[in-house]
Amino acid sequence: GSERTCCPVNWVEHERSCYWFSRSGKAWADADNYCRLEDAHLVVVTSWEEQKFVQHHIGPVNTWMGLHDQNGPWKWVDGTDYETGFKNWRPEQPDDWYGHGLGGGEDCAHFTDDGRWNDDVCQRPYRWVCETELDKASQEPPLL
């Protein structure tokens, strides 16, 4: 693998990671693919400090992160442990709400207008944030 020592053009460096903030919307899976095509992943929030950094950059806009429960339990896209990790859900969330009328529940997590998290229908075209780590030899994840 190759080591990334500085952030790509138009990405923001913070605490040895690079972040890219979209200005348009995609469904969660398409946002995930966008990040993967850039050798990155949807943002994985591991601390209150990182939460505040991302929140500052996205503003009060619904924005996808790399957290989903499409296969059952909640999982971060990079394998970070969900149960023991940082969480910032809104009260009463996640609720896997079925009342939206779009079919199914809510399996993908996003930042809401106040930065706290909500689960929502994965097909909604929200903005997203990609993240890639510096000084880490790039892994070769499974083929998509």
């Epitope: 693998g1 138009n10 348009s24 050798d39």
Partner: antibody, heavy 120, light 107 residues
């Protein structure tokens, strides 16, 4: 000057295999996602496959999934397309192309193409 | 998969004409629509990306607009070198599908 040069095309029998290469120069190859796009004779463009800069993430059209494999060797600035179990409808000119920065697969530089003909 | 259609499939125009080509997507999206020009025996050439961003080196007579499912490529004053086939492409969702093309020829 950005240059992309495909090679490896030719006449192949149905069921056969072929490996296409695309030699890149004039840009930092490892920093860019790359794609293969094909065009059957007298027809439109069909996106075939894409690969991230490191080679760690790959994407395929349904029509080639399981038969074609995209890869790259960043030390050689070369993109590859391994094509197995070829069929008559794979006959096309195959182009390699480079992705524009900060866009999802808009392709700003293309090679001249290499013709693959699948026929018995 | 997102299907892309183009209209018209072909058109005849004269030098100096204003030409408009429409691309329609089978599902709504924003931002991720690109336009290419292809001349016989040549590789495609990127004209417009992200709906309306003009690719470097492309003449300003080319412009793009649209959102949702309907997008437009406009050539404000057709020049002799503009007679070609034009393709739209969505890069919103894999597979990154192309439209069938619009052939612009001389009236």
């Amino acid at each position: 000057e950005v240059q992309l040069l495909e090679s490896g095309g030719g006449l192949i029998q149905p069921g056969g295999s072929l490996r296409l290469s695309c030699a890149a120069s004039g840009f930092t190859f490892r920093s860019y996602a790359m794609s293969w796009v094909r065009q059957a004779p007298g027809k439109g463009l069909e996106w075939v496959s894409a690969i991230s800069g490191s080679g760690g993430n790959t994407f395929y059209a349904d029509s080639v999934k399981g038969r074609f494999t995209i890869s790259r060797d960043n030390s050689k600035n070369t993109l590859y397309l391994q094509m197995n179990t070829l069929r008559a409808d794979d006959t096309a000119v195959y182009y390699c192309a480079k992705k524009v920065v900060d866009t999802a697969m808009a392709l700003d530089y293309w090679g001249q193409g290499t013709l693959v003909t699948v026929s018995s | 998969d997102i299907q892309m259609t183009q209209s018209p499939s072909s058109l005849s125009a004269s030098v100096g004409d204003r030409v408009t080509i429409t691309c329609r997507a089978s599902q709504s999206f924003s931002h991720y629509l690109n336009w290419y020009q292809q001349k016989p025996g040549k590789a495609p050439n990127l004209l417009i990306f992200a709906v309306s961003s003009l690719q470097s080196g492309v003449p300003s007579r080319f412009s793009g607009s649209g959102s949702g499912t309907d997008f437009t490529l406009t050539i404000s004053s057709l020049q002799p070198e503009d007679f070609a086939i034009y393709f739209c492409q969505q890069s919103y969702s894999t597979p990154f599908t192309f439209g069938p093309g619009t052939k612009v020829d001389i009236k």
